[in-house]
Interface confidence: medium
């Protein structure tokens, strides 16, 4: 960052999107600012308009190509600059040498579905979205289940230390409404972080058979 009150953070979704957030104390809300991306060895550059997301932070997405196109690799370096208009000229407010595969945040898993549900267990599957083929199987997942009367923050995390796009939830209560979420993270990258949580999948366990203990 150009000065100490400025923070410029970007993540690569591993395919064709770099999402950036820039925050600066005391910056004017109505200033027009952009993120400029200049790769070190690619024949394109890209710009996105920073839009306010809070009082002192702005965000934008650099769309590098079609969603599943592999636009960057582990050896790329992309110079990212925040440029803000000052009268007739542009001023550089922040800069970073962005190494995409050191700063990964994948898209949230999609297509969650109940494969099989019983009284005490439920098998759920999902798919990863726009994830690079470079990862092969080097991904991990976290999942959580929302029980009645609890919050998501209280839900214990279940960790899947391999690329496993399903889970069998056990010890559930019969005839009970639950919600389920999952997120994904590549093993690669010093600053890599978890994807956003998936959209919650609601499901209900089967009622216990009459006359049987639960």
């Amino acid at each position: 960052a150009v000065n100490g009150t400025s923070r410029f953070t970007c993540f690569y979704n591993s395919r064709a999107n770099i999402s950036c957030v820039w925050s600066q104390d005391g910056a004017l809300q109505d200033t027009s600012c952009q993120v400029h991306a200049w790769p070190d060895r690619r024949r394109w550059n890209q710009t996105c308009e920073l839009l306010p997301v809070s009082q002192a932070s702005w965000a934008c997405n650099l769309i590098l190509g079609t969603p599943d196109s592999q636009k960057l690799t582990a050896v790329d370096i992309v110079t990212l600059r925040v440029m803000c208009r000052e009268g007739v000229r542009w001023r550089m407010m922040a800069i970073q040498d962005f190494k995409p595969f050191e700063n990964l945040r994948l898209m949230a898993p999609i297509s969650l579905q109940v494969v099989h549900v019983e009284t005490h267990r439920c098998n759920i599957s999902w798919k990863i979205s726009q994830a690079s083929h470079y990862f092969e199987r080097h991904l991990e997942f976290e999942a959580r289940t929302l029980s009645p009367g609890h919050t998501w923050e209280e839900a214990p995390l279940m960790t899947l230390k391999q690329k496993q796009e399903w889970i069998c939830l056990e010890t559930l209560t019969p005839d009970t409404q639950y919600e389920f979420q999952v997120r994904v993270k590549p093993l690669q990258g010093e600053f890599t972080t978890w994807s956003p949580w998936s959209q919650p999948l609601a499901f209900r366990t089967k009622p216990a058979a009459l006359g049987k203990d639960t």
């Epitope: 200049w38 790769p39 070190d40 060895r41 690619r42 024949r43 550059n45 050896v75 370096i77 110079t79 990212l80 600059r81 550089m92 800069i95 970073q96 040498d97 190494k99």
Partner: antibody
């Protein structure tokens, strides 16, 4: 006009250290990556490393740990700090910058500075 | 590292001759760069992105190729073309150069 001017070369004993400078003019070192390349007498070109616009560095594994690239933005100058020098480090050292886009190749070169490592 | 192998290592040709230099990469590269270095001088960029002529470079110089095989051509050799020519890849780090081809006049 873009210009690069190296200095700081000379004779140094094996195991010694030397710091080369590359004074840039006609552009800001915070806007372009600048690279160091060397050429041993009668030999080909060897890329040593680069310092990118944002200040991060990249090195050839052959010199990583012994050579350090840095810059002084206020002086618009790049540096190559060379430690634990060996006879095989004897070469002309160039700084170079790509064209307007990095992938344009090394469009701008300094005149080079000779480093001789010998006892 | 990607190894760049130039051939020939030296050649002698007459003024007006067509001169061709090849550069073989040890693995596929996206684009190739070619430089001219006259004795005692810094290298000069001639070709970037495989086939694009750098600013101020005469049109007798050209480049082509893809994958692992690239070619540099001087369509009509001139006395001022006496120099060593280098190929270079910028597909992966470390950046690497060919060992050079020395061009002389017969």
């Amino acid at each position: 006009e873009v210009q690069l001017l190296e200095s700081g070369g000379g004779l140094v004993q094996p195991g010694g250290s030397l710091r080369l400078s590359c004074a840039a003019s006609g552009f800001s070192v915070t806007s372009y990556g600048v690279h160091w390349i060397r050429q041993a007498p009668g030999k080909g070109l060897e890329w040593l490393g680069a310092i990118w616009s944002g200040g991060s560095t990249q090195y050839n594994a052959a010199v990583k740990g012994r050579f350090t690239i840095s810059r002084d933005n206020s002086k618009n100058t790049l540096y190559l700090q060379m430690n634990s020098l060996r006879a095989e480090d004897t070469a002309v050292y160039y700084c170079a910058r790509a064209g307007d886009a990095n992938y344009d190749g090394f469009a701008y070169w300094g005149q080079g500075t000779l480093v001789t490592v010998s006892s | 590292d990607i190894q760049m192998t130039q051939s020939p290592s030296s050649l002698s040709a007459s003024v007006g001759d067509r001169v061709t230099i090849t550069c073989q990469a040890s693995s596929s590269v996206s684009f190739m760069y070619w430089y001219q270095q006259r004795p005692g001088k810094a290298p000069r960029l001639l070709i970037y992105d495989t086939s694009n002529l750098a600013s101020g470079v005469p049109s007798r110089f050209s480049g082509s190729g893809s994958g692992t095989s690239y070619t540099f051509t001087i369509s009509s050799l001139q006395p001022e073309d006496i120099a060593t020519y280098y190929c270079q890849q910028w597909s992966t780090y470390p950046l690497t150069f060919g060992q050079g081809t020395k061009v002389e006049i017969k």
